[in-house]
Amino acid sequence: CDLPQTHSLGNRRALILLAQMGRISHFSCLKDRYDFGFPQEVFDGNQFQKAQAISAFHEMIQQTFNLFSTKDSSAAWDETLLDKFYIELFQQLNDLEACVTQEVGVEEIALMNEDSILAVRKYFQRITLYLMGKKYSPCAWEVVRAEIMRSFSFSTNLQKGLRRKD
């Protein structure tokens, strides 16, 4: 499956929206930095097959959608930007779902990518626990926003690589 150019543009638009969502000076939040343990190995295009990488992207976007759909998130961010962000994520989920089922059958995908999907879920679990521990403070959300931007950037770069390999 060739990920459509629109997916890459959507990813870039999602990143821009995330960048625009910042509300407080990042400099005041340095003490809240945290190692969430981004599962980089899951997205390593050389080590894993394309279907696995796409499956991991899908899980990451789904989990991002879940994270930013909570009532705590709604209270933290600008509603208009958040709505636009949801639309971009929803579009990307549709693109990736089509790609995943095209690459391999649904049953095979579920079995083959269990470990990588679990790694992504655990990563987001760590993010959620961090936010809870910080009582969803503005700085905690800033740190999470920066972390999601970094993971999105990483997956965008890898998607470019996947398209070049086709």
Partner: antibody, heavy 121, light 107 residues
Framework: EVQLVQSGAEVKKPGESLKISCKGS????????IGWVRQMPGKGLEWMGI????????AYSPSFQGQVTISADKSISTAYLQWSSLKASDTAMYYC??????????????WGQGTLVTVSS | DIQMTQSPSSLSASVGDRVTITCRAS??????LNWYQQKPGKAPKLLIY???SLQSGVPSRFSGSGSGTDFTLTISSLQPEDFATYYC?????????FGQGTKVEIK
């Protein structure tokens, strides 16, 4: 390959203005902050200030607040450090370095080669 | 501002020696501490970040430890290329501040 390339050495007279640069390449310039560090001859490192090139938000050390201005042009992946009126005590080596911002990653992992500023009448 | 105090300010050692440099913060900085190496005429180089994480490409003879206010940089077996000045830096809050430096010289 990640690189921070600084502008060349400068010799200036007291009272003159100056703007030195730091150009980033090999990475997403707006994903990292750029910090500036001063080192006077034979002395230690002094942190001057920092900029987030994504929105040009800046923060300064109290010692340098009002003495220098930090700016960035993300369209050309370049950060700047400028003086409106140099003093002899500004004679030093100035380094730029990148910082991962709020992300958990090595701080100041790449540095520019330094710009030597000499202020003398 | 958070003050960083390094000790000693200089030391003489021989190749193969185990060298320890300490850094003390004026208030708790958790583990937000970095160590840099600087050689004459060169830019500083990051050795250790987050108190104990070894920066990519840095030899394993360098190690860092500590948390709160007291930190240590250890060179397990000093090599000729390790003669330089070492700086600690707190990274928990702005303004970032450096220690005054420790110069490691040949005995």
């Amino acid at each position: 390959e990640v690189q921070l390339v600084q502008s060349g050495a400068e010799v200036k007279k007291p009272g003159e203005s100056l703007k030195i640069s730091c150009k980033g390449s090999g990475y997403s310039f707006t994903s990292y902050w750029i910090g500036w560090v001063r080192q006077m001859p034979g002395k230690g490192l002094e942190w001057m200030g920092i900029i987030d090139p994504s929105d040009s938000d800046t923060a300064y050390s109290p010692s340098f607040q009002g003495q220098v201005t930090i700016s960035a042009d993300k369209s050309i992946s370049t950060a700047y450090l400028q003086w409106s009126s140099l003093k002899a005590s500004d004679t030093a080596m100035y380094y730029c370095a990148r910082h991962p911002g709020l992300n958990w990653a090595p701080d100041f992992d790449y540095w520019g080669q330094g710009t030597l500023v000499t202020v003398s009448s | 501002d958070i003050q960083m105090t390094q000790s000693p300010s200089s030391l003489s050692a021989s190749v193969g020696d185990r060298v320890t440099i300490t850094c003390r913060a004026s208030q708790s900085i958790n583990r937000f501490l970095n160590w840099y190496q600087q050689k004459p005429g060169k830019a500083p180089k990051l050795l250790i970040y987050a108190a104990s994480s070894l920066q990519s490409g840095v030899p394993s003879r360098f190690s860092g430890s500590g948390s709160g206010t007291d930190f240590t940089l250890t060179i397990s077996s000093l090599q000729p290329e390790d003669f330089a000045t070492y700086y600690c830096q707190q990274a928990i809050d702005l303004p970032f501040t450096f220690g005054q430096g420790t110069k490691v010289e040949i005995k």
